[in-house]
């Protein structure tokens, strides 16, 4: 119960983040105009991934696509990639992670199948979460280092009385969007990824059963060749023989649940 | 079409009050913001300030905070300039104009004659 | 505060005469966000209120005649009448719709000989 309640959540958790790293993608809002020690405009600028847009204070709104691929900055141009990766990276995870609820039944897909997909989603989820959170953290240093070159010289050809006020841009709603988002699907991975561990199917522990031929015991250990996780089922780092006989000598130890907390 | 309808003119005398309507028609009023302009005789034009349709928060410039009031009436897309304690100065041609695309004002009022005088 | 200043302050013409007035701005009125300059021009007739002709600097208002242009960048700008009509005959203001306050030009007083 626990288990499915893990990978229920994470699952949950995963969507919601992902669902915020498309929206943190698409939102205009990645640098917007600074306005604090700057003269009032009747014009808020503000910056996306993909277009920039200006709000006069009349309530009209332009904005303008970046029609170009060669012109843009290397910065912005990685930003897009690792967004874009996280995205497609979190879309596999969760359809891979729907088809590994515990919850949902496909035919007769075993246990260590959807402890294995759980696991996959798991990874795929840290993976897209860490390339947002990335990706956002990049762009957040790229408008730090431009905001204060451009604090340095912030009134430019001050010759006479003519003034040009430089427009400064401060971080915007969609990177506060990106991090959480990138946190959350990260979140999700990681408890994704222990879900997993509880999926792990578990040595059925049958009693020997002692067969005597020409005077030897012999204990026949069923179900040697149950599939392996890799998780819980050979954490004690035991010898398995594959479909092997063992003697009756042999002391058996079987991983019980509480070997997969 | 877009209309700016102004209440007509006005006799005051110094300390009194003064409230002048724009009635505006022709589009959805709460989509633009409305500004007040004023002309004195013989001088340029002087904004005033404006008022945010869609909330009713005004914004006065400086020379104008004090004794200038500006109001919405939203069901009878109505706004309103109240001038409180007149002064002799205040003797001029007041314009409400709406908001336009560019930060303009594209569409005026017909302007409000103001005379102050004792 | 954005100072104005328009130059000519009165220009007397004859009919179909090309015309050009000035506007500078103590400030640029260039916008970096989508690169338009946040200038206008209202053109207001005796007893009449002041009718939008050009914004962005350059931009017609509907239903303005073409014979009206407007130029420039940054702190200057000019209004070119490419054929006076007596219609025309009005007082031309340029406006800073820039930087709060939005602030005005003293006016150029268009005359006919």
């Known amino acids: 119960m626990a288990v499915t309640a893990c990978q229920g959540l994470g699952f949950v958790v995963s969507l919601i983040g992902i669902a915020g790293i498309i929206a943190a993608t698409c939102m205009d809002q990645w640098s917007t105009q600074d306005l604090y020690n700057n003269p009032v405009t009747a014009v808020f600028n503000y910056q996306g991934l993909w277009r920039s847009c200006v709000r006069e204070s009349s309530g009209f709104t332009e904005c303008r696509g970046y029609f170009t691929l060669l012109g843009l900055p290397a910065m912005l141009q990685a930003v897009r990639a690792l967004m874009i990766v996280g995205i497609v990276l979190g879309a596999i995870g969760l359809l891979v992670s729907i088809f590994a609820l515990k919850c949902i039944r496909i035919g007769s897909m075993e246990d260590s199948a959807k402890a294995n997909m759980t696991l996959t989603s798991g990874i795929m989820f840290i993976v897209s979460g860490l390339c947002a959170i990335a990706g956002v953290s990049v762009f957040a240093n790229m408008l730090v280092t431009n905001f204060w070159m451009s604090t340095a010289n912030m009134y430019t050809g001050m010759g006479g009385m003519v003034q040009t006020v430089q427009t400064r841009y401060t971080f915007g709603a969609a990177l506060f969007v990106g991090w959480v988002a990138g946190g959350l699907t990260l979140i999700g991975g990681v408890m994704m990824c222990i879900a997993c561990r509880g999926l792990a199917p578990e040595e059925t522990n049958y009693k020997a059963v002692s067969y005597h031929a020409s005077g030897h015991s012999v204990a026949y250990k069923p179900g040697g060749f149950k599939a392996s996780t890799g998780f819980g089922s050979n954490t004690k780092n035991k010898k398995i023989y594959d479909g092997g006989a063992r003697t009756e000598d042999e002391v058996q130890s079987y991983p019980s649940k509480h070997d997969y907390v | 079409q877009i209309q700016m309808v102004q209440s007509g003119p006005e006799l005051k005398k110094p300390g009194e009050t003064v409230r002048i309507s724009c009635k505006a028609s022709?589009?959805?009023?709460?989509?633009?913001?409305m500004q007040w302009v004023r002309k004195m005789p013989g001088e340029g034009l002087k904004w005033i300030g404006w008022i945010i349709a869609h909330s009713g928060e005004p914004k006065y410039t400086e020379d104008f905070k004090g004794r200038f009031a500006f109001s919405l009436e939203t069901s009878a897309s109505t706004t309103y300039l109240q001038i409180s304690n007149l002064k002799n100065e205040d003797t001029a041609t007041y314009f409400c104009?709406?908001?336009?695309?560019?930060?303009?004002?594209?569409?005026w009022g017909q302007g409000t004659s103001v005379i102050v005088s004792s | 505060d954005i100072v104005m200043t328009q130059s000519p302050s009165s220009l007397t013409v004859t009919a179909g005469e090309k015309v050009t007035m000035s506007c500078k701005s103590s400030?640029?009125?260039?916008?970096?966000?989508?690169?338009?300059?946040?200038l206008t021009w209202y053109q207001q007739k005796p007893g009449q209120p002041p009718k939008l002709l050009i914004y962005w600097a350059s931009t017609r208002e509907s239903g303005v005649p073409d014979r009206f242009t407007g130029s420039g960048s940054g702190t200057h700008f000019t209004l070119t009448i490419s054929s006076v009509q007596a219609e025309d005959l009005a007082v031309y203001y340029c406006?800073?719709?820039?930087?709060?306050?939005?602030?005005f030009g003293a006016g150029t007083k268009l005359e006919l000989k």
């Open positions: 406006q800073n719709a820039y930087f709060f306050p939005l602030t």
């Open positions: 104009a709406r908001w336009g695309k560019g930060n303009t004002m594209d569409y």
């Open positions: 022709g589009y959805s009023f709460t989509t633009a913001g």
């Open positions: 400030q640029s009125l260039l916008n970096g966000g989508n690169q338009r300059n946040y």
